[in-house]
């Protein structure tokens, strides 16, 4: 997150981190039920760990943290790397969470976001596009949903109904490492961090997010059948 601020501890209890090896964060994730996460399909890896209930970027133990393995990764069938359409994936964890003040699921919005809606995006991704500036703790940023027209003008030929754009003034954006993390609007999960221009946080190049309202049925059906 570029030019965000430290999230209040436990204010984003649905925020998850996908880790390679012992503690290499590469993507965010969102807890949507006691045993299921959502993330971006481009975050798919054969082996990874899941960390919930953690505030710090560092591997230091926190009393609220819970660690999991992914036992099933189910990318949306319409996703094709390295394209950006249908960029979502369900992850089934090896066990259910212990519900606590630090770890709680978030409800997915059934209605699509409208222009001007204020939302919160969060993550432990880079705080600049120099690739090695990471925050000490989870970052939060208020962003505004942009019109479809403005979104398409920003990225001609690259936007479809499975995406929406959101941003703020130049200098505020999600960035590398935030993928798969939550965009929460009015208390409900509206999107996932997906893509945007490089470097992050450029004028007229907003962040692009997976438009989850288009996938509510697929998410429910997939969870029910697995």
């Amino acid at each position: 997150i570029v030019n965000g601020s430290d999230c209040q501890k436990d204010a984003q209890p649905w925020q998850g981190a996908l880790l390679l090896g012992p503690n290499k964060l590469y993507c965010g994730a969102v807890l949507i039920s006691p045993q299921w996460l959502l993330t971006a399909a481009h975050c798919r890896k054969p082996v990874f760990r899941i960390r919930l209930g953690h505030h710090s970027m560092s591997p230091v133990y926190e009393s609220g943290q819970q660690m999991f393995q992914g036992i099933k990764s189910i990318p949306h069938p319409g996703y094709s790397h390295p394209g950006h359409s249908n960029d979502l994936m369900l992850i089934k964890m090896n066990r259910k969470i212990r519900d606590s003040h630090s770890v709680k699921p978030v409800e997915i919005a059934c209605d699509c976001a409208t222009e001007g809606t204020r939302c919160m995006v969060s993550g432990w991704g880079t705080t600049s596009s120099s690739h090695n500036n990471f925050p000490k703790v989870l970052q939060c940023l208020n962003i505004t949903v942009l019109s479809e027209e403005r979104c398409k003008n920003s990225y001609p030929g690259q936007i479809d109904k499975t995406m929406f754009c959101a941003g703020d003034e130049e200098g505020r954006d999600s960035c590398q490492g935030d993928s798969g993390g939550p965009v929460v609007c009015n208390g409900k999960l509206q999107g996932l961090v997906s893509w945007g221009d490089f470097p992050c946080a450029q004028r007229n190049r907003p962040g692009v997010y997976t438009n989850l309202c288009e996938f509510v049925k697929w998410i429910k059906d997939t969870m029910n059948s697995n």
């Epitope: 390679l20 090896g21 290499k24 964060l25 590469y26 993507c27 971006a40 481009h42 975050c43 890896k45 390295p82 394209g83 950006h84 991704g125 880079t126 120099s130 690739h131 090695n132 990225y155 690259q158 999600s174 960035c175 590398q176 490492g177 935030d178 993928s179 798969g180 961090v193 997906s194 893509w195 945007g196 221009d197 490089f198 470097p199 992050c200 450029q202 190049r205 962040g207």
Partner: antibody
Framework: EVQLVESGGGLVQPGGSLRLSCAAS????????MNWVRQAPGKGLEWVSY????????DYADSVKGRFTISRDNAKNSLYLQMNSLRAEDTAVYYC???????????????????WGQGTTVTVSS | DIQMTQSPSSVSASVGDRVTITCRAS??????LAWYQQKPGKAPKLLIY???SLQSGVPSRFSGSGSGTDFTLTISSLQPEDFATYYC?????????FGGGTKVEIK
């Protein structure tokens, strides 16, 4: 078949110019970042330039900054390297290479260059 | 710029030998290192990405390890087709930089 084919190399005098081209086929070119990498005779690999999928981010090695210009035409599935003010030390085989990392995607994961052309030879000599 | 230092610059080995090549970065690059193989007159070929992930189609006798500044490429049992030059490359930070190369020769 995924393929990159370079062209445009040749013999040029110091101070002269050349334009290299790289024709891509077998994959969705507009989704990938691209690089130019060169190799002087008997030497190792040297990264020259990078261009993101939408051309919004471009970078160069210090040794070519201000003299070389990378560009792409996604409609033509083509990558280019305009080389001006050429010097003897620019003599090398020039490769275009596909970057597996999508700088647009916001994961923190980096791959490398998975598809390379056969190379085109540039000789700068009087 | 990040400097990449490979060692040794050359190694003589026989078919069946275990060969280890090291690469050191002048600053930490996490796991974001790639290894390439290049045969004379040919383009480089990606062997390993993210320090330890094997590129599709690459034989399992090749493996990579390391994190931070120190990395290793290992060929567990050298085959005749493995005699080539090997390069490491750091990929997270521009300018991308390669190691100087390690030539694996027949003893």
């Amino acid at each position: 078949e995924v393929q990159l084919v370079e062209s445009g190399g040749g013999l040029v005098q110091p101070g002269g110019s050349l334009r290299l081209s790289c024709a891509a086929s077998g994959f969705t070119f507009e989704h990938y970042s691209m690089n130019w990498v060169r190799q002087a005779p008997g030497k190792g690999l040297e990264w020259v330039s990078y261009i993101s999928s939408s051309s919004s981010y471009i970078d160069y090695a210090d040794s070519v900054k201000g003299r070389f210009t990378i560009s792409r035409d996604n409609a033509k599935n083509s990558l280019y390297l305009q080389m001006n003010s050429l010097r003897a030390e620019d003599t090398a085989v020039y490769y275009c290479a596909r970057d597996l990392t999508s700088m647009q995607s916001r994961d923190y994961y980096y791959y490398g260059m998975d598809v390379w052309g056969q190379g085109t030879t540039v000789t700068v000599s009087s | 710029d990040i400097q990449m230092t490979q060692s040794p610059s050359s190694v003589s080995a026989s078919v069946g030998d275990r060969v280890t090549i090291t690469c050191r970065a002048s600053q930490g690059i996490s796991s974001w290192l790639a290894w390439y193989q290049q045969k004379p007159g040919k383009a480089p070929k990606l062997l390993i990405y993210a320090a330890s992930s094997l590129q599709s189609g690459v034989p399992s006798r090749f493996s990579g390890s390391g994190s931070g500044t120190d990395f290793t490429l290992t060929i567990s049992s050298l085959q005749p087709e493995d005699f080539a030059t090997y390069y490491c490359q750091q990929v997270p930070i521009f300018p991308y930089t390669f190691g100087g190369g390690t030539k694996v020769e027949i003893k």
